[in-house]
């Protein structure tokens, strides 16, 4: 089961954009929806990297805890290598159109691949979108 039963945690007022895929399939602007963050997941995340087995570009957006934003093994959750994690502290700040702009209150971490955070992200159901 999931590490966090997110549905049982209270909404915390933060809204972040959520998606999994790449910039054209799964994480395009049209496929990226706002979700309500819950519990301690009070930052908005963008994680980019390459995805096994074909080394294709891959991206994840969603809500995250501060520790997830700094997690050296975040890439393992999605079989991602050369992962770059960017988190920010305003609702909606991980909008796709802001990727090339400064993202307010953001901080970045760069890691090489690969511990078990996938359950947390799986619990951020895209169906929760606004």
């Amino acid at each position: 089961g999931p590490i966090l039963e997110l549905e049982n945690l209270p909404q915390n007022g933060r809204q972040c954009y959520s998606c999994k895929g790449n910039s054209t399939h799964g994480c395009s602007s049209e496929e990226t929806f706002l979700i309500d963050c819950r519990g301690p997941m009070n930052q908005c995340l963008v994680a980019t990297g390459t995805h096994e087995p074909k080394n294709q570009s891959y991206m994840v957006r969603g809500c995250a805890t501060a520790s997830m934003c700094q997690h050296a093994h975040l890439g393992d959750a999605f079989s991602m290598n050369h992962i770059d994690v960017s988190c920010c502290t305003k609702s909606g700040c991980n909008h796709p159109d802001l990727d090339v702009q400064y993202r307010g209150g953001s901080h970045h971490h760069h890691h090489h691949g690969g511990s078990g955070l996938n359950d947390i992200f799986e619990a951020q159901k895209i169906e929760w979108h606004e």
């Epitope: 007022g13 933060r14 305003k90 609702s91 909606g92 909008h95 802001l98």
Partner: antibody, heavy 118, light 107 residues
Framework: EVQLQQSGAELVRPGASVKLSCTAS????????INWVKQRPEQGLEWIGW????????EYASKFQGKATITADTSSNTAYLQLSSLTSEDTAVYYC???????????WGQGTLVTVSA | QIVLTQSPAIMSASPGEKVTMTCSAS?????MHWYQQKSGTSPKRWLY???KLASGVPARFSGSGSGTSYSLTISSMEAEDAATYYC??????????FGGGTKLEIK
């Protein structure tokens, strides 16, 4: 539950000032941009400006420069709108809203009616 | 400052009728957001990022557009849809101007 609770209605004299409050519950105001929006009787919505409570940065619509001052107190999770040199044109309902990074206002207070009358 | 013009200002529709209202911007904007307001109440979030429905908004609502031309459509009018709808633009910087509103009445 996310809520924005605004202060009560105000009846003020022309030339006076008034300070409205907007208190958030269910979220930290530092997570949002707190916006203020004006609606005159039977009229549309006008964006006054916003504050980033995290650092005190503000932005105003040009027509409200000098008329409106937006402040925030993060310790009480409250934002304020002060209106100065009031005239009948300032008679309106004023809404506070929680706005996100792309100008979307998902959270709205119930509004405060300000009536300027001698 | 970007000016938004909504049309028509007032319209009426019968139950089951398709409804389309438009919002025209004086210069290109990135996205259009929409709000619904009923008399005596605060505006409610309705659509964001041009085409995405806010939580609780019925699927009969849709939004589309780009550049300077945007629209909100109701595929089949219902009595509860009678309200005033405001568009509001987002480009990279404030001010976040609103349109003048379209008042939708039920026939």
């Amino acid at each position: 539950e996310v809520q924005l609770q605004q202060s009560g209605a105000e009846l003020v004299r022309p030339g006076a000032s008034v300070k409205l409050s907007c208190t958030a519950s269910g979220f930290n105001i530092k997570d949002e941009y707190i916006n203020w929006v004006k609606q005159r009787p039977e009229q549309g919505l006008e964006w006054i400006g916003w504050i980033d409570p995290e650092n005190g940065d503000t932005e105003y619509a040009s027509k409200f420069q000098g008329k409106a001052t937006i402040t925030a107190d993060t310790s009480s999770n409250t934002a304020y709108l002060q209106l100065s040199s009031l005239t009948s044109e300032d008679t309106a309902v004023y809404y506070c809203t929680g706005g996100n990074y792309v100008g979307w206002f998902p959270y709205w207070g119930q509004g405060t009616l300000v009536t300027v009358s001698a | 400052q970007i000016v938004l013009t909504q049309s028509p200002a007032i319209m009426s529709a019968s139950p089951g009728e398709k409804v389309t209202m438009t919002c025209s911007a004086s210069s290109s904007v990135s996205y259009m957001h929409w709000y619904q307001q009923k008399s005596g109440t605060s505006p409610k979030r309705w659509l964001y990022d041009t085409s995405k429905l806010a939580s609780g908004v019925p699927a009969r609502f849709s939004g589309s557009g780009s550049g300077t031309s945007y629209s909100l459509t109701i595929s089949s009018m219902e009595a509860e849809d009678a309200a005033t709808y405001y568009c509001q633009q987002w480009s990279s910087n404030p001010p976040y101007t609103f349109g003048g509103g379209t008042k939708l009445e039920i026939k």
